[in-house]
């Protein structure tokens, strides 16, 4: 029978298909950086190139016996679980061993940097096909470690990481914290968090979805034909890189940002349980569990968005929180969002010819989060129109008025720090359509874009009874690039997008005072891409 | 994710009075020094200098030299353990932590990191 | 202009214990490494200890280990050599150098005989 | 630890000859970190050379030094009545710091 975990993440109708690149060789590289490894082990003989690349600190302590089954444990297994012949994900592919990490599992920044240096020295040196690196390592935040990953991948090289197993915010963390990096918590059978000993997988914003990691059969270092089981990040990113390294094994084309977005949009949603995560993290945590998606060829033309959200701002009175798409996706919207209520809204703006998502904290604010929606809008061409506040009482009107461009999000930004003096922004489908409205003291800013067949229409619900939130989705085929809420109440949380639902917050004290006439609603931008239709907006 | 974490950033910019040694004129260092806010997870004495992303090749040989012979000057012993040329510019180096105002005040430094732990996860 | 100025030398009976001092000038004293070098009579040059700019590594000759330590105060500028337990052997000329042995005092002589 | 030795022990010239000291490790030397000095009696050293080949400040051009790895040569290219000393070299690379025994240049 199938282990659990090759179940989970491979659909049915991909069980028993081998992935083929078009020309018929799997040319796909998986370089893993960890332990040594047994090369020799019948699950992965033959495909394992161990390179000579050793860097390691010095294993503690007077007491310690190399034990060479215990040297290599943890890389034996992570190579099994990408490519074993039994239990592997993506079965034919090649592995080249870095060795960065000792027989205790402890490595270094500088010797994992002076690996990440050795494959691109390997790769300039003699160019191949795709590049996957597998990271099943954690230490403390690192900028220059994150910084390498970085460079690394935008030389067309894919990296997976595992998040960590410190039941913490994987943002704290290297190389899980680097943006450029797919980073990987663990999951159960039942497909819950994944608890080791008093600790676990980490989470947050930083954790770009989840894969099995525990109980995780594979290939054994104690001898040549032993399995056993291990669990971990680890494990769940080793899931994630064989799933690349099967999607790039079809389609060698595809890049990091079509990568991350195919497996966010095919994860399976909404099985994880969140109330396992601390409440400040529930909403920053995906909610996602990898599987191999379906080649572009079965799915081709679909709008593919995901959500990013910012670092917090922290609480002083003019923070601003900053959310970036990666290079090669669209910000096709900005919202914002405060625990406690008290933004100023958000915007967005060029910071070094790439747009980038802001909010700002408002007096007496615990501080904000930017969320931006990251979009794969082939040849797209996008622009930002604001208008400034208007006078007292006025409404200010902005709609996208270059020819073809639809309005694909509207991000509102209060002048005034006074919360009891404004009334908040509204967006109206029905009597202005394509337009973003902003009412007393807001700046509206309205993102447009041109893109082949791309058409938008405005989706709106809202409640006026107590409710902590107001949600409204886009129907199948349709996907949310902006989300909005237009309060009735005094003071909303703010909103933001989860897969293809837009969430609009409301404050606890708000929803107690509210009368039945005053409704929340949730404004949610949804868009399709009909590669042969022209760029529309639907009413 | 994330730009910066929550680790330390410490900035060394005091000004040294050297004995009239023209190339440590005192310019201020705007480089700063960043470690591993886990402290059992630091490797003090070992240090990732990165250099400005510009920089080219023989100007980070130069600048690892140059911490070398302006550490000697003031009878420390460092050594270079590796130069990172095709990643990012910059030097791993295991001096003591003495001369780390030195360090950020030479040219084309963005900032140093102090080595740290990673572990198998 | 750099200056070193050792003194605290003396005859001392063997046991015994001496403490000498070097008072530094011309330079910023806490970014350098400051050394002990002893002469004994007629003889070369043996390296005695070293101490790093914050004073939080120090070196020692096995020839003095457990019975000398090294230290300084950055604040008044002064290097030290306490000496315990002297013996015959340790009698010599002892100076003060700095960083890279570029500058040194003139010595201080000790003594030690009974 | 590294044990340098110097030859000759005594090198007897005239003014106006040029002396070359050797100085040989008992290991590899990292040669930024291997000096020379000159000492006359009742004086303290003084550093000549440091980084193996740098002429320290104020040192005359006649004084050079050369070598790498276990070898070393200090050259005076035409000696000097004041050159007439005692030359030490030294390693203070690793710890503990060694001084060869030194070669004495006298008058002939």
């Known amino acids: 029978s199938i282990p659990w975990n090759l179940e989970r993440i491979i659909p049915a109708w991909h069980q028993t298909e081998e992935d083929r690149s078009p020309d018929g060789s799997s040319q796909v590289e998986v370089y893993l950086l960890d332990t040594s490894i047994q090369g020799a082990h019948r699950e992965i003989e033959g495909r394992v190139t161990i390179t000579d690349f050793n860097s390691v600190p010095e294993e503690d302590g007077t007491r310690f016996h190399r034990q060479a089954s215990k040297c290599d444990s943890h890389g034996t297994h992570l190579a099994g679980v990408v490519s074993g012949r039994d239990a592997g994900v993506a079965k034919g592919t090649s592995l080249h061993s870095l060795r960065v990490l000792n027989c205790q599992g402890k490595g270094t920044v500088s010797g994992t940097l002076i690996g990440l240096e050795f494959i691109r020295k390997s790769q300039l040196i003699q160019p191949s096909g795709p590049l996957v690196v597998l990271l099943p390592l954690a230490g403390g935040y690192s900028r220059i470690l994150n910084a390498a990953c970085r460079h690394l991948a935008r030389t067309g090289v894919v990296l997976v990481a595992a998040a960590g197993n410190f039941r913490d915010d994987a943002c704290l963390y290297s190389p899980a914290s680097a943006p450029e990096v797919i980073t990987v918590g663990a999951t159960n059978a039942q497909d819950q968090p994944v608890t080791l000993g008093t600790l676990g997988t980490n989470f947050g914003r930083c954790v770009d979805l989840f894969a099995p990691g525990k109980d995780i059969i594979g290939a054994s270092s104690d001898c040549s034909t032993c399995f056993m089981s291990q669990s971990g990040t680890s494990q769940a990113a080793a899931h994630v890189a064989g799933i690349v390294a099967r999607m790039l094994s079809r389609e060698p084309t595809l890049t990091l940002a079509e990568l991350r977005q195919r497996l966010i949009h095919f994860s399976t949603k909404d099985v994880i349980n969140m109330a396992w995560f601390p409440e400040d993290q529930q909403v920053l945590t995906p909610n996602l569990v990898a599987t191999l998606p379906p080649s572009t060829h079965e799915t081709g033309g679909q709008l593919l968005c995901r959500t990013v959200w910012s670092a917090h701002s922290g609480p002083t009175r003019t923070a601003t929180a900053t959310a970036r798409c990666a290079p090669e996706e669209e910000l096709l919207s900005c919202s914002s969002f405060s625990r406690s209520g008290r933004r100023r809204g958000d915007w967005i703006e060029a910071i070094g010819g790439q747009q980038v998502c802001k909010a700002l904290n408002a007096f007496g604010g615990e501080g904000v989060y930017a969320v931006a929606r990251c979009c794969l809008v082939p040849r797209a061409n996008c622009s930002i129109h604001n208008t400034p506040a208007a006078r007292a009482g006025l409404e200010t009107h902005v709609h996208c008025h270059q020819k073809d461009h639809v309005l694909t999000g509207c991000s509102f930004h209060w002048e005034v720090e006074d919360l009891s003096v404004r009334r908040q922004p509204a967006l109206r489908s029905r009597r202005q359509p394509g337009q973003c409205v902003g009412h007393q003291a807001a700046s509206v800013y309205a993102s447009c874009c041109h893109a082949p067949g791309l058409e938008c229409k405005i989706k709106e619900h809202g409640i006026s009874g107590p409710s902590e939130q107001v949600t409204v989705a886009c129907e199948a085929g349709w996907t949310l690039t902006g989300c909005n809420v237009l309060p009735g109440a005094s003071l909303t949380l703010g909103a933001y997008s989860v897969d293809n639902l837009c969430v609009a917050r409301v404050h606890d004290t708000a929803r107690a005072d509210r009368t039945s006439g005053e409704a929340t609603v949730a404004a949610a931008i949804c868009c399709r891409s009909r590669p042969s239709a022209k760029a529309s907006w639907v009413q | 994710q994330d730009e910066d974490g929550d680790y330390e950033e410490l900035m060394l910019a005091l000004p040294s009075q050297e004995d009239g040694l023209a190339d440590e004129a005192a310019h201020v260092a705007t480089a700063t020094f960043r470690r591993c806010s886990k402290e059992a997870w630091r490797l003090p004495g070992t240090y990732i200098v990165v250099l400005m992303e510009e920089t080219q090749r023989l100007q980070i040989e130069q600048t690892a030299h140059r911490l070398q012979t302006r550490a000697a000057r003031r009878g420390y012993v460092i050594k270079v353990l590796h130069i990172f040329y095709d990643l990012f510019p910059g030097f791993l180096v295991k001096m003591s932590s003495d001369l780390l105002g030195l360090a950020l005040k030479l040219p084309h430094v963005e900032y140093i990191e102090e080595d740290s732990f990673v572990f198998a996860q | 202009q750099v200056q070193l100025v050792e003194s605290g030398g003396g005859l001392v009976q063997p046991g015994g214990s001496l403490r000498l001092s070097c008072a530094a000038s011309?330079?910023?004293?806490?970014?350098?490494?400051m050394h002990w070098v002893r002469q004994a009579p007629g003889k070369g040059l043996e390296w005695v200890s070293n101490?790093?700019?914050?004073?939080?590594?120090?070196y020692y000759a096995d020839s003095v280990k457990g019975r000398f330590t090294i230290s300084r105060d950055n604040s008044k500028n002064t290097l030290y050599l306490q000496m315990n337990s002297l013996r015959a052997e340790d009698t010599a000329v002892y100076y003060c150098?700095?960083?890279?042995?570029?500058?040194w005092g003139q010595g201080t002589l000790v003594t030690v005989s009974s | 630890d590294i044990v340098l030795t110097q030859s000759p022990a005594t090198l007897s010239l005239s003014p106006g000859e040029r002396a070359t000291l050797s100085c040989r490790a008992s290991?590899?030397?990292?040669?930024?970190?291997l000096a020379w000095y000159q000492q006359k009696p009742g004086q303290a050293p003084r550093l000549l050379i440091y980084?193996?080949?740098s002429r320290a400040t104020g040192v005359p051009a006649r004084f050079s030094g050369s070598g790498s790895g276990t070898d070393f040569t200090l050259t005076i290219s035409s000696l000097e009545p004041e050159d007439f000393a005692v030359y030490y070299c030294?390693?203070?690379?690793?710890?503990?710091?060694?001084f060869g025994q030194g070669t004495k240049v006298e008058i002939k």
């Open positions: 011309g330079f910023t004293f806490s970014d350098y490494y």
């Open positions: 101490i790093s700019g914050s004073g939080s590594t120090t």
């Open positions: 150098a700095r960083g890279m042995f570029d500058f």
């Open positions: 290991q590899s030397v990292n040669s930024n970190y």
């Open positions: 030294q390693q203070w690379g690793d710890v503990p710091i060694t």
């Open positions: 980084g193996a080949s």
